[in-house]
Interface confidence: low
């Protein structure tokens, strides 16, 4: 009888992660008697995948009834494939020996390649807020994909970004890969409603890329602009001074009125109005009893926004002038704006 040959007809098999791989193997003869074993890899470090004779291999099933005496089909199925299962699988015939079975002949091997989808991209922004005109970095990470070829793009509100760096790790052969990309984005005052999108395209996604997003509302801080104005009220000895706080984000804001440098009132922005661009406006007013003052009064509206150093604007209230003659007096002195970021 012709000497037994072990035939593995498939040089390679490509399987998607989570599916079942079928590894085909037939023998041309029943002689010599002995079991078949499947290994991943060759040489002394090879990994036993299935032993026809003994052992428990919960992920492996045989294609045909391997216990039948005349069976020469030793194909197996491996369930729930992961990228870690990639490698070359060998079907090896053993002949019965004593005390141990002896390796007799091996098949040529079947390379199992696993196509694994990338994980949903996770986009992370900076740990602290930044103001418009600043450049901030966003990172995008996706893991567990195979093969290595992958395309990553960045978008801001649908416009593709070009200032980014991408790495796919590891550089050499691996069962699966990770991608890490960092994009630089320049903030504008209109970015409260903006989104940064990381888009990953891979062969396993069949043309339907995965996207991760970050809302710039989590990243941006738009400092307020202040305007202090004065209006007379019906009572001749009273003046209504308003502080308009405009175009700020986020909402966290505290306003303090000072009269000649002394704190008059502190309040936290509550009933704000929202602008179309997502920023907020707020107004606070102070009713000043002019008759209580002999000299001119310096009124200061001081705003602390989002934990940043205070910004203030002052208004000189002339006590000597009749309030009604001052209705249009909007002269205001800016006592300094500090937009230093505290991260």
């Amino acid at each position: 009888e012709e000497e037994l040959q072990v035939i593995q007809p498939d040089k390679s098999v490509l399987v998607a992660a989570g599916e079942t791989a079928t590894l085909r193997c037939t023998a041309t003869s029943l002689i010599p008697v002995g079991p078949i074993q499947w290994f991943r890899g060759a040489g002394p470090g090879r990994e036993l995948i299935y032993n026809q004779k003994e052992g428990h291999f919960p992920r492996v099933t045989t294609v045909s009834e391997s216990t039948k005496r005349k069976n020469m089909d030793f194909s197996i199925r491996i369930g729930n494939i992961t990228p870690a299962d990639a490698g070359t699988y060998y079907c090896v015939k053993f002949r019965k020996g004593s005390p141990d079975d002896v390796e007799f002949k091996s098949g040529a091997g079947t390379e199992l390649s696993v196509r694994a989808k990338p994980s949903a991209p996770v986009v992370s922004g900076p740990a602290a807020r930044a103001t418009p005109q600043h450049t901030v970095s966003f990172t995008c990470e996706s893991h567990g994909f195979s093969p290595r070829d992958i395309t990553l793009k960045w978008f801001k509100n649908g416009n593709e970004l070009s200032d980014f760096q991408t790495n796919v790790d590891p550089v050499g052969e691996s069962v699966s890969y990770s991608i890490h990309s960092t994009a630089k984005v320049v903030l504008t005052r209109e970015d409260v409603h903006s989104q940064v999108i990381c888009e990953v395209a891979h062969v396993t996604l069949q043309g339907d890329p995965l996207r991760g997003t970050a809302n710039l509302s989590e990243t941006i801080r738009v400092p307020p602009t202040l305007e202090v104005t004065q209006q007379p009220v019906r009572a001749e000895n009273q003046v209504n001074v308003t502080c308009q706080v405009r175009k700020f984000y986020p909402q966290r804001l505290q306003l303090t009125w000072l009269e000649n440098g002394n704190v008059s009132r502190t309040e936290t922005a509550s009933t704000v109005t929202e602008n179309k661009d997502g920023t907020y406006n707020w107004m606070s007013w102070l009713l000043v009893n002019v008759s209580a003052h002999r000299d001119d009064v310096k009124l200061t509206c001081q705003v602390e926004h989002d934990g940043q150093p205070a910004v203030s604007k002052s208004h000189d209230l002339k006590v000597s002038a009749h309030p009604k003659e001052q209705g249009s007096n909007t002269a205001a002195e800016n006592t300094g704006s500090n937009e230093r970021n505290i991260y």
Partner: antibody
Amino acid sequence: QVQLVQSGAEVKKPGASVKVSCKASGYTFGGYGISWVRQAPGQGLEWMGWISAYGGETNYAQKLQGRVTMTTDTSTSTAYMELRSLRSDDTAVYYCAREAGSSWYDFDLWGRGTLVTVSS
Amino acid sequence: DIQMTQSPSSVSASVGDRVTITCRASQGISSWLAWYQQKPGKAPKLLIYAASNLQSGVPSRFSGSGSGTDFTLTISSLQPEDFATYYCQQGASFPITFGGGTKVEIK
């Protein structure tokens, strides 16, 4: 597993310096700030300062200004806090804490603490 | 700096009791307040963030309320594992500040 692992207890003499490390794992280190908080024996919690693991920016408590330095090493996902010119009232458990990722500051992940004893 | 004043400094209670701890900020901090639980020899654990939001994994018997300057932590039905020290912390601006702590002891 998401965790912050701190270096071991230290005994120092007055005037010396101590450097405590805090190694992060299980999350993207650069995405969060780290604060250092200390607790003297039998006392409450005292915030020492904050560092952005992303950009290295810092903000220190005024009383420690000039004596404390906070740094990060993104390659090892480790934050460091160095306190110089140690005094006996610096004896405390020093904690690193990760900010919870919100736009304000609270801490959802803490190290186990490092006991620093300052004694002559 | 924003001062945080906690009261009471200690409270004796029994299992099943309703316990309320208050925290007052020296100036308005909107809702930027967190509550922590600390047991002896352990690091603090975040219970409540943004004044009233329950941190993931924290039992629903803990609740927080308040805004501006006055805040409350409530334990609806005290359990044996709740005997600990509780701290409030403002996260509105630097420097971050903690309350002095409230020790919940067994009656």
